[in-house]
């Protein structure tokens, strides 16, 4: 069964998903999905890394962790009830039939009608958003644009703002973790 | 246009190996899950194995694992697949096929399919 | 393993008739399943996958329908072409499992 994790509309929310590399740099494919992970890959993918960088996503999805560590959990950027459903993080360690697959249920709960204030500071603002693509076909040149001027230390920086450290110490034990090598 | 042409089957003895080949052409090939799938005279179809872009994952039918090895070389196109210790319930028709795939979605099903090789394993 | 269970196993229809055959799946597949045609001699064609989007170039009086457990591909008007085997194939567990074909053939 699917671990479950949840958001309220209009939040970000954050499905945890890590796995060790072997050495510094030495990355794993992933991929996330809509939709419990298939037999390969990932349906309806929303973002995929390969051995080097993200190679694909889409709006409002991202990875705020340093996935060159990684933590490949995925954040979703305000949220609706249409978010709602089953997640599949997919871990694709080279070898025979060793990919290892997660199931993440994403439960969005409507908004609380007074919301109280938040002092977050607006991470689309502080760190414009990468150039997005929607690819349709292998053969089809994705343009994806590049990072802004800022190193990967004041892009964690910046992403540890979003998330309590508590609540992320929380979600990390509780995530899809697994140790490569 | 998009092809697949298997090669390598025939008859073979009880214990013997074949080298399956599928040449691929009309798509660029390294951006594709390639799959066999097999079809024993007058059944149904069985899948054998896949293997991914690079040919870093490869996935295989449970009970054939130890005996079949899927490969691929993209900088000549061509699919294998290493059959050793062939048995009679071997024999079949066997299919290349193309893993449907766009970025946005997952290569589990097969658009393009080659017109098959048959092997025959037999005494 | 998941097991695909087509029924009817074969099917005698005429031209015009419209044509429903069943896929059951042993267990939960989401709607990770897919429909191919096959012809005596061919190899398998693509019909529809993910249950029901149908692939590039198949004609409209063919559709999928289902989730879950069961699923169903439908054709609304049979052609002369049409008569063929039918099987479905889950995607969703390893390995990768089809039915055992539902025959259709001209009554």
């Known amino acids: 069964s699917e671990v479950e994790y949840r958001a309220e509309v209009g939040q970000n929310a954050y499905l945890p998903c890590f796995y060790t590399p072997a050495a510094p740099g030495n990355l794993v494919p992933v991929c996330w999905g809509k939709g419990a992970c298939p037999v390969f890959e990932c349906g309806n993918v929303v973002l995929r890394t390969d051995e080097r960088d993200v190679n694909y996503w889409t709006s409002r999805y991202w990875l705020n962790g340093d996935f060159r560590k990684g933590d490949v959990s995925l954040t979703i950027e305000n949220v609706t009830l249409a978010d709602s459903g089953i997640y599949c993080c997919r871990i694709q360690i080279p070898g025979i039939m060793n990919d290892e697959k997660f199931n993440l249920k994403l439960v969005i709960k409507p908004a609380k009608v007074t919301p109280a204030p938040t002092r977050q500071r607006d991470f689309t603002a502080a760190f414009p958003r990468m150039l997005t693509t929607r690819g349709h076909g292998p053969a089809e040149t994705q343009t994806l644009g590049s990072l802004p001027d800022i190193n990967l230390t004041q892009i964690s920086t910046l992403a540890n703002e979003l998330r309590d450290s508590r609540l992320a110490n929380d979600l990390r034990d509780s995530g899809a973790t697994i140790r490569i090598g | 246009e998009v092809q697949l042409v298997e090669s390598g089957g025939g008859l073979v003895k009880p214990g013997g190996s074949l080298r399956l080949s599928c040449a691929a052409s009309g798509f660029t090939f390294s951006d594709y899950y390639m799959t066999w799938v097999r079809q024993a005279p007058g059944k149904g179809l069985e899948w054998v194995a896949s293997?991914?872009?690079?040919?870093?994952?490869?996935y295989y039918l449970d009970s054939l694992k130890s005996r079949f090895t899927i490969s691929r070389d993209n900088a000549k196109n061509i699919l294998y697949l290493q059959m050793n210790s062939l048995r009679a319930e071997d024999t079949a028709v066997y299919y290349c096929a193309r893993g449907y795939y766009y970025y946005g979605s997952s290569p589990n099903y097969f658009d393009y399919w080659g017109q098959g090789t048959l092997v025959t394993v037999s005494s | 393993d998941i097991q695909m269970t087509q029924s009817p196993s074969s099917l005698s229809a005429s031209v015009g008739d419209r044509v429903t055959i069943t896929c059951r799946a042993s267990e939960n597949i989401y709607s990770y399943l897919t429909w191919y045609q096959q012809k005596p001699g061919k190899s398998p064609k693509l019909l529809v996958y993910?249950?029901?989007t149908l692939a590039e170039g198949v004609p409209s009086r063919f559709s999928g329908s289902g989730s879950g457990t069961q699923f169903t591909l439908t054709i609304s008007s049979l052609q002369p072409e049409d008569f063929a085997t039918y099987y479905c194939?889950?995607?969703?567990?390893?390995?990768?499992?089809f039915g055992q074909g539902t025959k259709l053939e001209i009554k």
């Open positions: 293997i991914n872009y690079d040919g870093r994952n490869t």
């Open positions: 194939q889950q995607h969703y567990g390893t390995p990768l499992t």
């Open positions: 993910n249950a029901k």
